[in-house]
């Protein structure tokens, strides 16, 4: 039976959520964001072997064609399936405002 | 001025919609699909340089962190932004049925 969550490459090698610690400078935000000063960025990293966390039919097609034509068709890619929102305190022309971004932090991952 | 659709790597090198001609056998569908016998598969292929077709804030973050930590954080990846539906005539235990798939053919692409 196919197991879409068992990584055939070994633990932690396949597409999954990682956390990367980053400063405002790292993110290129220092000139427009005041807070937070540091962000625990959650993002999707890892390989997408056959049948692993396939997002949809398109991912299945892509994998099959990648196996046939690896120089033409890339393997599916590990990307966010959904996001967690985050509030930023950002600089404006007149001071600061609160702005919530819905597409900033990955919540879970799949292969497309 | 930033242009999210101008490829700095040269024409056709960046993330865009490609069409790949595939048979049912190529797709691994020969045992369950009757028609179509061949599919013009539209998929997203190409590089995602900085600021090119960035899907969202997460893609911007990923690119900035990739430049800082290329061994840890991969570049954004070219994936479908939306899909075109497609109908398949598929085999069933008793004969055939029509089934529409909403997530089979890429319609347009972006970098995530």
């Amino acid at each position: 039976a196919r197991n879409g969550d068992r990584c055939p490459l070994g633990p932690g090698r396949c597409c999954r959520l990682h956390t990367v610690h980053a400063s405002l400078e790292d993110l290129g935000w220092a000139d427009w964001v005041l807070s937070p000063r540091e962000v625990q960025v959650t993002m999707c990293i890892g390989a997408c072997p056959s049948q692993f966390r396939e997002a949809n039919m398109h991912a299945q097609i892509k994998m099959n064609l990648h196996r046939l034509k690896p120089d033409t068709v890339p393997a599916p890619c590990c990307v966010p399936a959904s996001y967690n929102p985050m509030v930023l305190i950002q600089k404006t022309d007149t001071g600061v405002s609160l702005q919530t971004y819905d597409d900033l932090l990955a919540k879970d991952c799949h292969c497309v | 001025a930033r242009n999210g659709d101008r490829c700095p790597l040269g024409p056709g090198r960046c993330c865009r919609l490609h069409t790949v001609h595939a048979s049912l056998e190529d797709l691994g569908w020969a045992d369950w699909v009757l028609s179509p016998r061949e599919v013009q598969v539209t998929m997203c292929i190409g590089a995602c340089p900085s600021q090119f077709r960035e899907a969202n804030m997460h893609a911007q973050i990923k690119m900035n962190l990739h430049r800082l930590k290329p061994d840890t954080v991969p570049a954004p990846c070219c994936v479908p932004a939306s899909y075109n539906p497609m109908v398949l005539i598929q085999k069933t235990d008793t004969g055939v049925s029509l089934q529409t798939y909403d997530d089979l053919l890429a319609k347009d692409c972006h970098c995530v």
């Epitope: 807070s35 937070p36 600061v96 932090l105 | -």
Partner: antibody, heavy 118, light 106 residues
Framework: QVQLQESGPGLVKPSETLSLTCTFS??????????VGWIRQPPGKGLEWLAH???????RYNPALKSRLTISKDTSKSQISLKLSSVTAADTAVYYC??????????WGQGTTVTVSS | DIQMTQSPSSLSASVGDRVTITCKAS??????VAWYQQKPGQSPKALIY???YRYSGVPSRFSGSGSGTDFTLTISSLQPEDFATYYC????????FGQGTRLEIK
């Protein structure tokens, strides 16, 4: 827009536990960086921070009151509860809840008056 | 804990005056200071974040400055609606407030 509404018993007897609820709208405690804090103001006096709870369920308490305070959240109901045990007359105050964005009290509720008296 | 000492505790001024309120932290709090305005019978309202940034909607006559231990809130030209009590707040450590400055009409 952001709204916060405090509710409480109004009158509490000494040695009892005070239970307060903050019902909020216009933001979500599932959003990274968001939190809700409780601050009180005794009659004619200044502001005193009591506790806060963050999106990631991290809780912080005023060290001077920590043993008497409990804060909790019900994200699905958009409610925050605060309990203050063993109350005395010194706990008579207006109790405010406030939206926190990171560490800043960006927006405050109207407050609820609590009197401790037998 | 970090003490925030505001001065003066009360102040009389006239419409059009320039007013400065100071706040001194008992230890370095970087720029992690906010200012709030509270009118009688109302809840506090955010004015300034990170020592010097006005919150959206706050009139430009309000300004903040300082870093480390010394902070000021300045109202460049007092308007009738500015007569209120002002509080500083540090959020570098667990939150503490100044004791307040009551601004009255002369």
């Amino acid at each position: 827009q952001v709204q916060l509404q405090e509710s409480g018993p109004g009158l509490v007897k000494p040695s009892e536990t005070l239970s307060l609820t903050c019902t909020f709208s216009g933001f979500s405690l599932s959003t990274s960086g968001m939190g809700v804090g409780w601050i009180r103001q005794p009659p004619g006096k200044g502001l005193e921070w009591l506790a806060h709870i963050r999106w990631d369920d991290v809780k912080r308490y005023n060290p001077a009151l920590k043993s008497r305070l409990t804060i909790s959240k019900d994200t699905s109901k958009s409610q925050i509860s605060l309990k203050l045990s063993s109350v005395t007359a010194a706990d008579t105050a207006v109790y405010y809840c406030a939206q926190m964005a990171w560490d800043w009290f960006a927006y405050w509720g109207q407050g609820t008056t609590v009197t401790v008296s037998s | 804990d970090i003490q925030m000492t505001q001065s003066p505790s009360s102040l009389s001024a006239s419409v059009g005056d320039r007013v400065t309120i100071t706040c001194k932290a008992s230890q370095n709090v970087d720029t992690d200071v906010a200012w709030y305005q509270q009118k009688p019978g109302q809840s506090p309202k955010a004015l300034i974040y990170s020592a010097s940034y006005r919150y959206s909607g706050v009139p430009s006559r309000f300004s903040g400055s300082g870093s480390g231990t010394d902070f000021t809130l300045t109202i460049s030209s007092l308007q009738p609606e500015d007569f209120a009590t002002y509080y500083c707040h540090q959020y570098n450590s667990y939150p503490t407030f100044g004791q307040g400055t009551r601004l009255e009409i002369k």
